[in-house]
């Protein structure tokens, strides 16, 4: 399972994705899209 | 301009598997994540997951787990959504698409044509 | 996951009248009072286009007369005064969760 970063600090659970709200602003990944800082 | 560019119509018979492409221009590749979306005819549109041309990691919906794989090449700026064991159920057009993200100063989305797979024996 | 529902299925209204669509969402859509709720347009033979995204936001190069409003789990996507170039399905999507989810679409047509 994947991690991905997020800067609003949720989680989804079902997916076991866990979304952290340090290093957004660094942009070290692809853009998700339709959320907030998401980038994996 | 940021464009999309999938694949031509395949015709598969059940049991088979397709592989369609999707070739990104116009933006950095690996800056934002390749989503896949289906539409069975006449129906109602379905997320199948997304992709990172940046890390190569992949996020499907359950639903196809273990038939769909998706992945990218960047040296061609492509990336691929394969579903495999395909029934009848699976016709419909395939989309790529791009989303920018909440955050950004602007907010649209990106799309490719369209590749419709139809599964027939 | 979380199951997108969609009202009426379809709906015919005057040119110059206005045209509500309803979204329901089988548990709320919100975080840190964000809406993670998005509208789509889709004309026949075209792939979709993101109309309102966050609930309330327009979409880059999207009419005024297309609003969206609502939080948690019901929302509304308003157009204002129905033009015959709106004539399409509109969708309502969410993001907040994988595996992302649509509604069934209402299509809207000229009486």
């Known amino acids: 399972d994947a991690e991905f970063r997020h800067d609003s600090g949720y989680e989804v659970h079902h997916q076991k994705l866990v979304f952290f709200a340090e290093d957004v602003g660094s942009n070290k990944g692809a853009i998700i899209g339709l959320m907030v800082g998401g980038v994996v | 301009q940021v464009q999309l560019v999938q694949s031509g119509a395949e015709v598969k018979k059940p049991g088979a598997s397709v592989k369609v492409s999707c070739k990104a221009s116009g933006y950095t590749f690996t800056t934002y994540a390749i989503h896949w979306v289906r539409q069975a005819p006449g129906q109602g549109l379905e997320w199948m997951g997304f992709?990172?041309?940046?890390?190569?990691?992949?996020n499907y919906n359950q639903k196809f787990k273990g038939r769909v794989t998706m992945t990218r090449d960047t040296s061609t700026s492509t990336v691929y959504m394969e579903l495999s064991s395909l029934r009848s159920e699976d016709t419909a057009v395939y989309y790529c698409a791009r989303f920018d993200n909440y955050d950004r100063g602007y907010v649209r989305d990106y799309w490719g044509q369209g590749t419709l797979v139809t599964v027939s024996s | 996951d979380i199951v997108m529902t969609q009202s009426p299925d379809s709906l015919a209204v005057s040119l110059g009248e206005r045209a509500t669509i309803n979204c329901r969402a089988s548990?709320?859509?919100?975080?840190?009072?964000?809406?993670?709720l998005n509208w789509y347009q889709q004309k026949p033979g075209q792939p979709p286009k993101l109309l309102i995204y966050?609930?309330?936001k327009q979409g880059t190069g999207v009419p005024d007369r297309f609003s969206g409003s609502g939080s948690g789990t019901d929302f509304t996507l308003t157009i204002s005064s129905l033009q015959a170039e709106d004539v399409a399905v509109y969708y309502c999507q969410q993001s907040k969760e994988f595996p992302w989810s649509f509604g069934g679409g209402t299509k809207v047509e000229i009486k």
């Open positions: 992709t990172s041309p940046y890390s190569g990691v992949s």
């Open positions: 548990e709320s859509v919100d975080n840190d009072r964000i809406s993670f």
């Open positions: 966050a609930a309330t």
